[in-house]
């Protein structure tokens, strides 16, 4: 067992992972395939599912993090978050209750989703026992996007970030000391998950997102690959 | 860890009123944390949440009269226009979403009760 | 709006039985259920979450289960503690919102 910096002892029992308790990558369950009795998910479906997906296993880096390091516990995190310049949801985002607008929130979503790659980049070889795990959470996530893509009206307003920076400001983190790289995954792993708790919030307001259909076994489907798209 | 209400007590219709919850040993930027009330012999009533991100949801019959809000050690809730209906011990809790939404509230304080005649 | 809809409303039970209690959502919830024991005078407690997933410190004689939108909490081999009354909580969704709580189910040990 292990306490991450939000206090909850984990454990990797999630409504949608196969039987054998083991994360499915997106796309590899091939149980899934020969199912005929079950109903097409649809695209709110599938987000929602993409982004519990990606939270799990969020959660499985946070754990190794923690048990490696003492960044779950640290008070100096603020003074290492003023530096990195961290996607995070405001009022004016309008993804919150209050003020919701599902374009504006949808544009906030994507744009946040893009701003948050180069920090996915950087978590990659940052994990030992959780390497793939780093890997399936950026995939995922890029999969995540083009769902998000497909949903969204106004494409035109959602900002790509420019690769020169970026490849500018992987180089400057990747060259941090130890400690300050620590931190740095800590307060990416943890921003990401809020940020996508704060999204999932939004996207169950949006319409049709109902629950994920289930199996006669009663486990969830799993799936969500690029061919879905 | 602890959380613990105060501010309930006896008031007429109509007035104004804050309830406070306090928390110890609880880092408030990484936990959600929400107000259910619980009128007297009847169930549990959700008033609200403030999620990590700062962010409110309320019951859609609260929304407007109640508003919460938090400080690093202190999570407020504001009511308004208050009617004997609102007459209740008003409990704060702390959530965990470990994962994703799944807001579970896993420890209570003991409640503070308004009493609206 | 996701309404929690808890049957029965109060049950007897005999010491050493068994006791089930229902818990409908208005619509699916995606196995995100809690389950809380709440005795007179008393805060409500965390029993399980996540559909089955038991709390700390809870007896294992506490079982829950469901899938979708129909959720079950099962005592068994009842004891006098076991005394109190059991609200279901939905956490999939917090907009649209009535009340994130069914109405609460009295156990009554005879």
């Known amino acids: 067992d292990y306490k991450d910096h939000d206090g909850d002892y984990k454990d990797h029992d999630i409504d949608y992972k196969d039987d054998d308790d083991k994360l499915v990558p997106p796309g590899e369950d091939s149980k899934d395939v020969a199912a005929p009795h079950r109903q097409p998910l649809t695209s709110s479906e599938r987000i929602d599912k993409q982004i519990r997906y990606i939270l799990d296993g969020i959660s499985a880096l946070r754990k190794e993090t923690c048990n490696k390091s003492n960044m779950c516990e640290s008070s100096k995190e603020a003074l290492a978050e003023n530096n990195l310049n961290l996607p995070k949801m405001a009022e004016k985002d309008g993804c919150f209750q209050s003020g919701f607008n599902e374009e504006t929130c949808l544009v906030k979503i994507i744009t946040g989703l893009l701003e948050f790659e180069v920090y996915l980049e950087y978590l990659q070889n940052r994990f030992e026992s959780s390497e793939e795990q780093a890997r399936a959470v950026q995939m995922s996530t890029k999969v995540l996007i083009q769902f998000l893509q497909k949903k969204a009206k106004n494409l035109d307003a959602i900002t790509t970030p420019d690769p020169t920076t970026n490849a500018s400001l992987l180089t400057k983190l990747q060259a941090q000391n130890q400690w300050l790289q620590d931190m740095t995954t800590h307060l990416i792993l943890r921003s990401f998950k809020e940020f996508l708790q704060s999204s999932l919030r939004a996207l169950r307001q949006m319409g049709d997102l109902i629950s994920v259909p289930v199996d006669s076994r009663g486990s969830e489907q799993k799936l969500i690959s690029e061919e879905d798209l | 860890q602890s959380v613990e209400e105060s501010g309930g007590r006896l008031v007429t219709p109509g007035t104004p009123l804050t309830l406070t919850c306090t928390v110890s040993g609880i880092d408030l930027s990484s936990y959600d944390m929400s107000w259910v009330r619980q009128a007297p012999g009847k169930g549990l009533e959700w008033i609200g949440y403030?999620?990590?991100?700062?962010s409110t949801y309320y019951a859609n019959w609260a929304k407007g009269r109640f508003t919460i809000s938090k400080t690093s050690t202190t999570v407020d809730l504001k009511m308004t226009s208050l009617t004997t209906e609102d007459t209740a011990t008003y409990f704060c809790?702390?959530?965990?979403?470990?994962?994703?939404?799944?807001?579970?509230?896993?420890?209570w304080g003991p409640g503070t009760l308004v009493t609206v005649s | 709006a996701y309404d929690m809809t808890q049957t029965p409303a109060s049950v007897e039970v005999a010491m050493g039985g068994t006791v089930t209690i229902k818990c409908q959502a208005s619509q699916s919830i995606s196995n995100e259920l809690s389950w809380y024991q709440q005795k007179p005078g008393q805060p409500p407690k965390l029993l399980i979450y996540?559909?089955?997933t038991l709390a700390s410190g809870v007896s294992s004689r506490f079982k829950g289960s469901g899938s979708g939108t129909e959720y079950t909490l099962t005592i068994s081999g009842v004891e006098c503690a076991d005394a109190a009354t059991y609200y279901c909580?939905?956490?999939?969704?917090?907009?649209?919102?009535?009340?994130?709580f069914g109405g609460g189910t009295k156990v009554v040990v005879v």
């Open positions: 403030i999620y990590t991100d700062s």
């Open positions: 996540r559909t089955s």
């Open positions: 809790a702390k959530g965990s979403t470990d994962y994703a939404f799944d807001t579970r509230l896993d420890l």
């Open positions: 909580q939905q956490g999939y969704n917090s907009n649209d919102v009535d009340n994130v």
